[in-house]
Each structure stands twice: as C-alpha cells, then as structure tokens.
C-alpha cells in the first residue's frame, strides 16, 4: 500500500522536512503533490512526469519544494504555515490513480528562558517566594530544576500557571539552592541560567568552643563563639553578666582562680532582628607540682637486665599514668606496674625499649607530664653485613669491603682472610687484586660493653670469566592488572653490564617496564596476560659475557566475560539445545550453569535433548577463577516455539 512518511514528523522553523514515499507502484506515468488531505488543483504544489523528467510547479508552490524521481518531496526553510497534511497523487500507466496522505507539524525554536522572582531576600519560616519562567510561550512545556535535580516532592513546593510559576512556601535555609527553569517543545529545549535563592535565617543558639570548662591557673583562656546565621551574626561577650567586648573570640591570658564564672555569648542578626545567647561556666584550678622519673639502671643490657622507672614525687591519693613513645602503655608480659602505678618495671629489656618514657600525675582538671626519659640499652653486635654484595671481581680492580653490625655501644671490627687476621678496621681495602685474593673474607664485630662477638663470612671470587647468570623473581604467579613483578639477575658482580631480552628481543619501550639497580633488576608494573613471555638476562664485562636460561612468566588473569555459543536465542520444539560457554582465564575457569536461577551442572557445555516450550527462560553461565579471586557471568534468554508456529532456528 502506498504510504507517506514524514522525516522528521515534528519540524523546527527554518529546518527542512522530507516526505518519503513507500511502496511506490511500478509502471507510473507521473505524480503530483497537494497541500491538504485531498487532491485539489488550487492547492497543487508540484507535478512530475516520469517520461520527460519534467517538474511543473502548481499554485501552492513556494519555491522551497524539491521533488525527487522516487516521488519524495523535500520542503526547505520550513515556516509555521507549512504545518498540516500533504497528499501524493500517483498516475499509473494504466491511468488508474492512487493517493496517499502524510503530515508533519512545525514548531518554533524556543528562546533561552530566564527566571523572575517576587522576593530576593526571604526570611526563613516566614516568607514565600514565587519564581516565574519567562517568557510565556504557546505550546511549550515548563520544567524546574533544583541543584540540577528534578523538583523534590514537598508540600512547600507548588507549581501553577501551567507549571510556569514555582512557589516555595515558608522558605527554610535548606532552600538556598540553584534554581533553573526549562522550556520544551517537540523540536527544542532551553534551560535558563541558575538563580541562587538567598534565604535570611538565624541566629541559631550559639555554640561556645572549646567545650572544656576546667582550666589551670596560668593557662590562657581562648573562647570562640559561633551561631549559624545569614547574614553572619554579630557577637558580644558577657562575664558574670558584665559586657566585655563585641568580638567572636574572647581571649584572657594567664588566668587565675578569680577568672572562674559564667561566660555568655550573644549572637545578633541585623536583618532578621533576632538575638540568641549561650552560657558556659568556667572553673580555674590552682597548679600542682611537675613530676619527674628516676631509674634504677641507666645502662641495661639487652635480654639480660630489668629496669625499674619510678614517678616522683610520691603524693597520697594521686593517680599516676605512664606513656611510652607518646602512647599509653602497650599490653606486654614484660611490662609490670606497681599497685599504686608509681613504678614501671621493664623485664628483660630489648633495644626497642629505649623510650622515651613519661609519667604523669592526674588532678581534677588535667594531667601533668614529666620530662621524657630515654634508656640507653646496651645490645649487639648483631650478625654483621658486608657490603657491597658483589661476590665476583675481575683481576686488577681494587677490593673495598665495608662491615656493619647493629650495636650499642658501636662495635669494634676485625677482618680475617681465610682465617688469618688482617686488620682492626671497619673497612678492608686491597688494591689491584689477583686470582690469589679469592677466598673466605670474615668480618668480626665485638661489643666491649657486653663482651659479645659475631662474625659473617663472604666468599670472594677473583676471575676474568663471568659465571652463567640466573634470574630470581619476587612473584612467580602475578595477577593481571594488580601485581608487579621484579626480576633480578644474579649474581651481583662488579664492573659488569646487565642486559635483558624478552622473547629473544631487546626490551620494548614501555612505561610499565623499569630497569633499576644498575639494570640488574627489571620490574614489570601492572602485569598483563601479554607479559607471559620468556625473559633472559645477560652479564658482560670487557673479557666475557654470559646469558641466563629463560624464565617464563605465568600471569594469572580472568575470567573475562564469558561468551555463550551459538548466538541463536530462538529454537523449535523438539530440537536439541547445545550451549557452549567460553571465557579467557588462567588458570582455566570453573564453569557452572543456572537455568532460571536454578543451579545445573559444572560443565563447559550444556546439552538438553528435545526441548519444549517448558525450556523457555534465562540460561546463565558462571565462570570462576580461584587464583585471581575473580568471577564473571553472562545471561542468555532462550525462547522455544511449538513446532510450525515460528520461523525460529533449530540447533
């Protein structure tokens, strides 16, 4: 059947519309377009003869119409008057005529609206405000936005005048917001600039801070007052009813017991004319003595000695408190307090017990702290460390070894080579070494105060030939997009160049690849599955070079969003349903199926023979990877039609 489609149906003034013809018959002589719902010669727009490809304007032709060989009509630069019906008259070669009618509507482009208000400074809980969206426009819909959200449901909000006017009754401070109006018609929508509502409110009851009401003699009193208010409140202070000053803060230095009393803050809002007050009672106490700590052992030995710390002076009916490292005492079987808490005993001290320690005496008001005391714990030496960590050296270079062991007091050092004493220094230096300098290098650390000694032995090899390197890794199975992996080329050798290859190629340029530690360490940040490659490191110096065996990175990833195949979703009754699920994952994911939410089997393939409409529903494939801790799923809807009722697919 011949039909006309208008694209678009709603047209903005000045734009164009295409009257598109569908199902145009074969063997045509020509066709004519008419304004209106019927064929009327006085309202003919244009005629077209196919044989001559001649278009002839009619009485209703405006010069803005273009007719196409497929009978479609384009009208440009649309005006309001173009709204309405258009009829196509088709003359076939057998002189049998056909007609079809289409229509479109024309709307103006809307101007940008603005908001007018009847009250620019409403008072909270008293005034109402009416916003009006300008200008008034015919056939337009009006919408309102508060803080870019649609209007909340509230008995205090009322729309009127065809939604053009928004009234806020009994405004509150929470109505201080950005208001916008919007006009819409089928072809355009315009939003106004925002209008901010300035609600006058307060003052609320002021709050005085800080909240503490007890002070010690000699302290400074610094009170601050704040009351929620718009415009901001003006503040006044009264002490025992006597006016002091008109400031938000009251400051009295070096207070005494005489400064005890009632302190009143008054807040005033000049626009609302309201006053509010709050009173706080301040008590000033006299100063107690400052405590100090005595110790029974100023140089205890680690893991051997105990130390008793006592808080002085002894005062009856006083609470004693202790702090270690500016924290309250930790729970520890090595810490013991006497019954009155005055003595703190540290059993079997360690180097971590140095402190500082503080004690305190509590009075009605506050806690007085002692000066901190630090313990001088004698410890060590620990096992010494020899640096640098190189074990391979080339002949001709200088050997410079340094030894360090944690110790208090600092350790005394001795060096031995193959068991023979060399010197009593922290550093050992041998110039121009040869293969004969290979051997066992021992550093001995001694603590004269504790009498303890510890040694560390390092094997030094002096050789022109470099050993075959190997790769160590800090993470053998990293998780994709989460973990980093650091490969280190072993051993560490002096005056040696370190090189890396990935899959037999030199390192690609990537912000995720970083070389450090003199190129000895290769770090891969945020590994991906594509990083699962063969990594090789190489070492070289001026006389030899060697490469490690490859190390392959096993990246754990997935499961990705699964895919169910085949993609068909319609089946005929009696067919076999054979769904296969696949998800990229390392290790391979565990699969499971649910039909309409009911768990089925844990296989990759779900097979149901001779399905019926009872098998309609949602088929979900779930995938799980315990190694990455991630899960994924996909849902597919299956429709089974009774045989012969649908052109659906069969599996």
């Amino acid at each position: 059947k011949l039909t006309i489609e208008s694209t678009p149906f709603n047209v903005a003034e000045g734009k164009e519309v295409l009257l598109l013809v569908h199902n145009l018959p074969q063997h045509l002589f020509g066709y004519s377009w008419y304004k209106g719902e019927r064929v009327d010669g006085n309202r003919q727009i244009i005629g077209y003869v196919i044989g001559t490809q001649q278009a002839t304007p009619g009485p209703a032709y405006s010069g803005r119409e273009i007719i196409y060989p497929n009978a479609s009509l384009l009208i440009q630069n649309i005006i309001q008057n173009d709204t309405g019906f258009y009829t196509l008259h088709v003359i076939k070669s057998d002189l049998v005529n056909e007609e079809a009618t289409g229509q479109f509507r024309v709307y103006p482009e809307l101007p940008k609206p603005s908001i007018s208000s009847n009250n620019s400074k409403p008072v909270e809980d008293k005034d109402a405000v009416a916003f009006t969206c300008e200008p008034e426009t015919q056939d337009a819909t009006y919408l309102w936005w508060v803080n870019n959200q649609s209007l909340p449901v509230s008995p205090r909000l009322q729309l009127s005048n065809g939604n053009r006017t928004l009234t806020l009754f009994n405004v509150t401070r929470n109505d201080t917001a950005s208001y916008k109006c919007e006009t819409q018609n089928p072809v355009s929508a315009r939003r106004s600039d925002s209008v901010i509502l300035n609600v006058l409110y307060g003052p609320d009851a002021p709050t005085i801070s800080p909240l503490n009401t007890s002070y010690r003699s000699g302290e400074n009193l610094n009170l601050s007052c704040h009351a929620a208010s718009n415009p901001p409140a003006q503040y006044s202070w009264f002490v025992n009813g006597t006016f002091q000053q008109s400031t938000q803060e009251l400051f009295i230095p070096n207070i005494t017991v005489n400064n005890s009393g009632s302190y009143t803050c008054q807040a005033h809002n000049s626009d609302t004319g309201l006053n509010r007050t709050t009173v706080t009672t301040i008590t000033v106490y006299a100063e107690p003595p400052k405590p100090f700590i005595t110790s029974n052992n100023s140089n205890p030995v680690e893991d051997e000695d105990a130390v008793a710390l006592t808080c002085e002076p002894e005062i009856q009916n006083t609470t004693y408190l202790w702090w270690v490292n500016n924290q309250s005492l930790p729970v520890s079987p090595r810490l013991q307090l006497s019954n009155d808490n005055r003595t703190l005993t540290l059993l079997s001290v360690t180097r971590n017990d140095v402190g500082p320690y503080e004690c305190g005496i509590q009075n009605e008001l506050s806690v007085d702290h002692s000066d901190p005391v630090i313990l001088n714990v004698l410890y060590g030496p620990d096992d010494p460390t020899i640096s640098p960590s190189y074990t391979y050296y080339r002949p001709g270079v200088n050997l410079s070894l340094s030894c360090h062991a944690a110790s208090n007091p600092p350790a005394q050092y001795s060096w031995l080579i193959d068991g023979n004493i060399q010197q009593h220094t922290q550093e050992l230096f041998i110039s121009n070494i040869t293969e004969k300098n290979s051997g066992l290098y021992t550093c001995q650390a001694n603590n004269s105060a504790s009498g303890h000694s510890r040694t560390t032995v390092k094997t030094i090899t002096v050789s022109a030939e470099l050993p075959k390197p190997s790769i160590s890794s800090n993470n053998s199975k990293p998780v994709e997009d989460k973990d980093a992996v650091a490969f280190t080329c072993e051993p560490e050798a002096q005056n040696t160049t370190y090189l890396w290859w990935v899959n037999g190629q030199s390192l690609p340029v990537s912000p995720r690849l970083q070389l450090s530690n003199g190129n000895r360490t290769l770090t891969l940040f945020n590994v991906t599955r594509n990083d699962a490659r063969a990594y090789v490191c190489g070492i070289q110096n001026s006389v030899s070079a060697n490469r490690s065996d490859p190390v392959t990175l096993d990246v754990l990833y997935g499961p990705d969003t699964p895919i169910i195949s085949p993609p068909d979703s319609s089946y005929l009754s009696g067919a076999n349903l054979n769904l296969s699920c696949h998800s990229a994952s390392n290790p391979s994911p565990q699969y499971s199926w649910r039909i309409n939410g009911i768990p089925q089997q844990h296989t990759q393939v779900l097979f149901i023979a001779k399905i019926t409409p009872n098998n309609n529903g949602t088929y979900a494939c779930f995938v799980s990877n315990l190694a990455t801790g991630r899960n994924n799923s996909i849902v597919k809807s299956i429709t089974v039609s009774a045989s012969g009722t649908s052109p659906g697919l069969s599996a």
Epitope: K477, P587, S588, P589, Q590, Y591, S592, Q601, H602, T603, Q604, V605, L606, F607, L626, A627, G629
Partner: antibody
C-alpha cells in the same frame, strides 16, 4: 542416576598389556571428562590421566606417558584405559572417575574399580 | 609437580571429638583443593571441593578451610560411621596429586 561400571578383574604377566573399560550412564557422556586413578594394595591414590570424550583429547601424568593410552567410544558411552609393558608394581585397583565439571574440578563419581594383578 | 603432604598419617579419637586433618601444598594452589573419604573396601567419596564447598548430601559436621598452601578438614563431632581414610587432592591443573592419606579410627 550417574553410574560408572568397570570391567572385571584381570591377571597379567610382566611385559603384557591390559585394557580396562568404564561404561558411563545417567548423564550426558560427552559433557564430562573421565579420569583414571589407581590404588596399589594398602597404598594411597595415584592419578594416571584423563580423557575428554567429546574431543578425544588426553592428558597423562608424566609417570605414565607412553605406557598409558585412553580412548572413548561415544556410541556406547565407554572409555578405555590400556596400560602396556606391565610390571609387578602396576598391581593395583584401577578406578575411572568423572570430573565434577570441566577444568580444575575434583572427581565426584567413581567406578567400582578393576583389580589388575601382574604376576609371573 | 605439586606435592601434597597430609598430617597426621593416622589418628584415634573418641565419638563426639573434634577432629582436624591438615594438608600442605608445595606451592600456592589458591583454593583448588578437594577432600575425599574412603571407607575400607569402598571407593573414594568426594566430600569438599574448592577448599570449603560441601558436596550436596555430605553431613554438615564436615567442613573445610584454608587457601594458598595450608588447608584443613574438620569433623566437628566424630561419629562411628566416619571411620575411614581421608585424602586431600589439589585440582589446580594437571597432574592432579593426592596426599598420602590420614586414617581415622575410634578410640
């Protein structure tokens, strides 16, 4: 209900081969992978390998590589495990077992076991 | 290959006791661990998979826990019918390997 029924006991001489069968029923044969596990007298369980009956893909423990052969006949829903070059230490109960799902799942249904005795 | 080590190799406990069997993997197997029960002369029976998932029909007194390399099977209140050998098995890729088994008896 799911059932795995294995062939009867076998006595073989060293150097010979043995072929054990496992007939599956009560589920879709091609959807689940079948594994073979053995247990020597008084000993623990030892995994031999598995077969995917749908594709015929096999995966063997390194210890049995080249000596064990697994096959599947989808028309009879039966899997077979042949072990060649038998020695006395192959004397064991051989179990077929179905994997609970596909990939990284354990074994949920087991056959009754087939005792294979290797003795001269 | 991943080695699985079970402990103890055997234990004897009274009816109602809480029994714990541990299994350690030679490398990280995440949560891919199963527990089996094998009664004398019977075939193994799957109790738990994915370290903590109880198979349907298995009594709730059996529970599993752990991840990484260390795993535990707990029987909260031992019953006479629980006399069996218990095996752990990793199902993190092939080759699957089993623990050497823990024999549980009643005192």
């Amino acid at each position: 209900q799911v059932q795995l029924v294995q062939s009867g006991a076998e006595v073989k001489k060293p150097g010979a081969s043995v072929k054990v069968s496992c007939k599956a029923s009560g589920y879709i044969f091609t959807s689940y992978w079948l594994h073979w596990v053995r247990q020597a007298p008084g000993q623990g369980l030892e995994w031999i390998g598995y077969i995917n009956p749908n594709t015929g893909y096999t995966n063997y423990s390194q210890k049995f590589q080249g000596r064990a052969t697994m096959t599947a006949d989808t028309s009879t829903s039966t899997v077979y495990m042949e072990l060649s070059s038998l020695r006395s230490e192959d004397t064991a109960v051989y179990y077929c077992a179905r994997e609970y799902g596909n990939y990284n799942y354990p074994l949920d249904y087991w056959g009754q076991g087939t005792l294979v005795t290797v003795s001269s | 290959d991943i080695q699985m080590t079970q402990s103890p190799s055997s234990l004897s406990a009274s009816v109602g006791d809480r029994v714990t069997i541990t299994c350690r993997a030679s490398e990280n197997i995440y949560g891919y661990l199963a527990w089996y029960q094998q009664k004398p002369g019977k075939v193994p029976k799957l109790l738990i998979y994915n370290a903590k998932n109880l198979v349907e029909g298995v009594p709730s007194r059996f529970s599993g826990s752990g991840s990484g390399t260390d795993f535990t099977l707990t029987i909260s209140s031992l019953q006479p019918e629980d006399v069996a050998t218990y095996y752990c098995q990793h199902h993190y890729g092939t080759p699957y390997t089993f623990g050497q088994g823990t024999k549980v008896e009643i005192k």
